[in-house]
Interface confidence: low
């Protein structure tokens, strides 16, 4: 993922501050919280691997880059970063590996310049639909977020709520249409079996989408048509068997796209013919010469680019009377 950005957005929040939501004592300008390291020159505060159980209340108002990694935060409540005066310059917030399992509605409210948020490597069993929008209105105030890093946020299976993890994450991404300005979204290593069909259409500003190391079997119902700004699409290390004509045409129609498809179990039968033809012609697939067949057994490790139509056959389906056990 990207390094923290140093440019603060000019977006400002009009939400009123509630006394209960902000720390009572305004911090001294040069104060540094206990267990943290601060650099006013670099506008950076690092509270790393300190087993913190809550966000420090006395963060300096100058902070632009905040690292709260490797802690034991468990829950991020509403207004977790609300302060008086507000942390008006905070642009990059890294909370990775901090044992967060619950992020509540409005957790990131009152951060008017927050452009980059990293929640990776937290077992998020309960991610509120309004974690990023801060409001249950059908259309929320736009979030200033430009980069959202959510790699490996899937909790162990025995700690998940009894619902679709994919659905929970997508609900948070789409709530209130708050993330219309999002340019980078990383969702790698989350065991996703599918991508809900409406998610990409509602994130029209995306430049970079990372879905690598999931369990995606098919993209048949996923539309990339609206993602005219998309520059990179990472689909490595999934369970993709073939890309069908509709998907191929949509990808080919994106003007700036680079697609990464390594390490998928491609099935090289008659259904693969269109994809092989497309691969031979397209420039959008990076490392296309590395793509190899996984199935059927007779085709294993064959390079897709070296196949021709005669190689790509489907065994005839025998009528029931001719099938043997």
């Amino acid at each position: 993922s990207s390094s923290p950005t140093s440019s603060a957005s000019s977006f400002s929040s009009s939400a009123p501050f509630l006394a209960s939501a902000v720390s009572a004592q305004p911090p001294l300008p040069d104060q540094c919280p206990a267990l943290c390291e601060c650099s006013e020159a670099a506008r950076t505060v690092k509270c790393v691997n300190r087993n913190l159980t809550e966000v420090p209340t006395d963060l300096p108002a100058y902070v632009r880059n905040l690292f709260l990694t490797g802690n034991q935060l468990a829950v991020l409540p509403a207004g977790a970063f609300a302060r008086r005066p507000p942390l008006a310059e905070l642009a990059a917030l890294n909370l990775s590996g901090s044992r967060l399992d619950e992020v509540r509605a409005g957790a990131f409210e009152h951060l008017p310049s927050l452009r980059q948020l990293d929640l990776s490597h937290n077992p998020l069993a309960d991610l509120s639909p309004f974690a990023f929008s801060g409001s249950n209105a059908s259309v929320s105030a736009p979030s200033p977020l430009v980069e959202l890093i959510l790699n490996h946020i899937v909790p162990p299976e025995d700690e998940r709520q009894n619902r679709s993890f994919e659905g929970m994450v997508v609900a948070a991404l789409l709530a209130g249409r708050a993330l219309q300005g999002l340019r980078r979204l990383e969702l790698a290593s989350n065991h996703f079996l599918y991508l809900p069909r409406d998610v990409l259409a509602q994130l029209p500003s995306l430049r970079h989408l990372d879905l690598s190391n999931n369990s995606l079997v098919s993209l048949t119902y996923v539309s990339f048509r609206n993602l005219t700004h998309l520059e990179s699409l990472h689909l490595e290390d999934n369970a993709l068997k073939v890309l069908h004509n509709g998907t191929l045409a949509e990808l080919q129609g994106l003007p700036h796209i680079r697609v990464f498809l390594d390490n998928n179990p491609w099935v090289c039968d008659c259904h693969m013919a269109d994809m092989v033809t497309w691969l031979k012609e397209t420039e959008v697939v990076q490392g296309k010469d590395r793509l190899t067949c996984a199935y059927p057994e007779k085709m294993r490790n064959r390079v897709l680019l070296e196949l021709n139509s005669a190689d790509l056959d489907c065994d005839p389906i025998l009528p029931p009377s001719l099938q043997t056990s």
Partner: nanobody
Amino acid sequence: EVQLVESGGGLVQPGGSLRLSCAASGFTFSSYAMSWYRQAPGKERELVASITTAGGSTRYADSVKGRFTISRDNAKNTLYLQMNSLRAEDTAVYYCNAELGPRRLGMDYWGQGTLVTVSS
């Protein structure tokens, strides 16, 4: 082929210590969270401890908090469980687990287990 091989079990007196190891191969060890489970005779398998990819986040069953420590060495592809102040109720077969994908697709892997017996 994914392989998880536990070692370090044995007979120990109450109050004693053991260190279990799990050598992993066949997958990118550093990319996956890892766990230790245990199963006592006649009981269901239970989660003992888990650790995230870089080791920045750990969690423990209430019954072992403060006594057991899970850790990993990504350079050696090895998972560890340091067990101190052992009690008779810790007697069980301990299993190393790698959840490489959804369990409902059979994408979690288990070692063969190592027996820990706490007895005087």
